[in-house]
């Protein structure tokens, strides 16, 4: 996908993606609300794969750990907040079952907002 | 996860999101920047499971379609674009390889500013 | 105690919109996924359409591009939307409690689709 | 899309038997799969989830067993309140979630 910063954009919130393995990860928070251990590997023809996400949360060293770009200030409180999505990884649960499940990873930095009182 | 919307929050972009089949997508890019075909069934020990994306995107009919919601107007133009994000999926390239491949989808709508020139 | 309570329900013509509403109480709603099965007179369980705890709806084969799910978790109630209804469209509507399997259903919402 | 096929459809039975339905699933769903009781003009009511981990305030004398494609469900001493239908449901190939077609149980 095109970057917004080649075309002069700016984010309203700062955010960071990186590549995290099982390994990284180690648990994780399936459809069911319940904690399960993401494998390392997965089977496939032929051999393995190392499990791999890739993650985007809100990058805490940025300009934007106050809150949000841009922002009219005297109408809106805003915090830049890390957003989930589901995704399907290779787990196993506490009754150490092992299969495929959706679980939660972090995908995005959106702004919020919430109105100013009182003025 | 908390809800934002239950702490009386806006988004700054409205988003949607639905479970996308890999009947619905057909095809996808790759990482390399290539299209391949999803596959919409993944072979498991003792049967198959059907391909399911979970994607987020900008929503067409939301109040933010004009621009994001709480911008400083004064210096800013913005707009809520869909971001998209990588996860595994099971395809076919054009040469008719089938393997797992990190595939483009769908993950969330983010606020992208421009600086208001000529003030 | 968890309580969910089914709205909206009643006799419309074919092609037709319609929308049923689901008050959830005694939980932490925005916590759950969400879920309208149907069962038409006489007939089994059907899964219509059900939505996650992070907002992702998912729709069944026979109501994709007619049905809308939504929740609004700021007044712990969730929406199906069902837009050019058919005849066998017929059925109670349960909105029940859950991602994978079902702990808590409301008692029911009957929708008749008759000319 | 994964079927499950519940039999018998209709069941016969006197109050204080053992009753024993089964469901069979058309491809492995471990043990991601859950029973509900259904009684006419009310709503289903979860029984058994995981196969066969009874939900709260389920009385002793239901129980649930089978992994893989084959599960049952056991009635033991089986009540007057039982005469119902009872659904499987697997919620491993999710979505779509399916339910079996019901067996009926009723008084001989």
């Known amino acids: 996908h095109s970057d917004p910063a080649r075309r002069g954009e700016l984010s309203v919130c700062d955010s960071i993606s990186e590549w995290v393995t099982a390994a990284d990860k180690k648990t994780a928070v399936d459809m069911s609300g319940g904690t399960v251990t993401v494998l390392e590997k997965v089977p496939v023809s032929k051999g393995q794969l190392k499990q791999y996400f890739y993650e985007t949360k809100c990058n805490p060293m940025g300009y934007t750990k106050e809150g949000c770009r841009g922002i009219d200030k005297r109408h809106w409180n805003s915090q830049c907040r890390t957003t989930q999505s589901y995704v399907r990884a290779l787990t196993m649960d506490s009754k150490k079952r092992i299969g495929w499940r959706f679980i939660r990873i972090d995908t995005s930095c959106v702004c919020t907002l919430t109105i100013k009182r009182g003025r | 996860h908390s809800d934002p919307a239950r702490r009386g929050e806006l988004s700054v972009c409205d988003s949607i999101s639905e479970w996308v089949t890999a009947a619905d997508k057909k095809t996808a890019v790759d990482m390399s920047g290539g299209t391949v075909t999803v596959l919409e069934k993944v072979p498991v020990s003792k049967g198959q499971l059907k391909q399911y994306f979970y994607e987020t995107k900008c929503n067409p009919m939301g109040y933010t379609k004009e621009g994001c919601r709480g911008i400083d107007k004064r210096h800013w133009n913005s707009q809520c674009r869909t971001t998209q994000s990588y996860v595994r999926a099971l395809t076919m390239d054009s040469k008719k390889r089938i393997g797992w491949r990190f595939i483009r989808i769908d993950t969330s709508c983010v606020c992208t500013l421009t600086i208001k020139r000529g003030r | 105690d968890v309580q969910l309570v089914e709205s909206g329900g009643g006799v419309v013509r074919p092609g037709e919109s319609l929308r049923l509403s689901c008050a959830a109480s005694?939980?932490?709603?925005?916590?759950?996924?969400m879920t309208w099965v149907r069962q038409p007179p006489g007939k089994g369980l059907e899964l219509v359409s059900h939505i996650v705890d992070l907002g992702g709806g998912y729709y069944a084969d026979s109501v994709k591009g007619r049905a809308t799910i939504s929740r609004d978790n700021s007044i712990d109630t969730f929406y199906l939307q069902m837009n050019s209804l058919r005849a066998e469209d017929t059925a109670v509507y349960y909105c029940a409690r859950g991602n994978t399997f079902f702990d808590y259903w409301g008692l029911g919402t009957l929708v008749t689709v008759s000319s | 899309e994964i079927v499950l096929t519940q039999s018998p459809g209709t069941l016969s039975v006197s109050p204080g038997e053992r009753v024993i339905l089964s469901c069979r699933a058309s491809q492995n769903v471990r043990s991601d799969l859950a029973w509900y009781q259904q009684k006419p003009g009310q709503a289903p009511r979860l029984l058994i989830y995981d196969s066969s981990t009874r939900a709260t305030g389920i009385p002793a004398r239901f129980s649930g067993s089978g992994s893989g494609t084959d599960f049952t469900l056991t009635i033991n001493r089986l009540e007057p309140e039982d005469f119902a239908v009872y659904y499987c449901q697997q919620y491993y190939d999710w979505p779509p979630l399916a339910f079996g077609g019901g067996t009926k149980v009723e008084i001989k």
């Open positions: 005694g939980f932490d709603f925005s916590s759950y996924g």
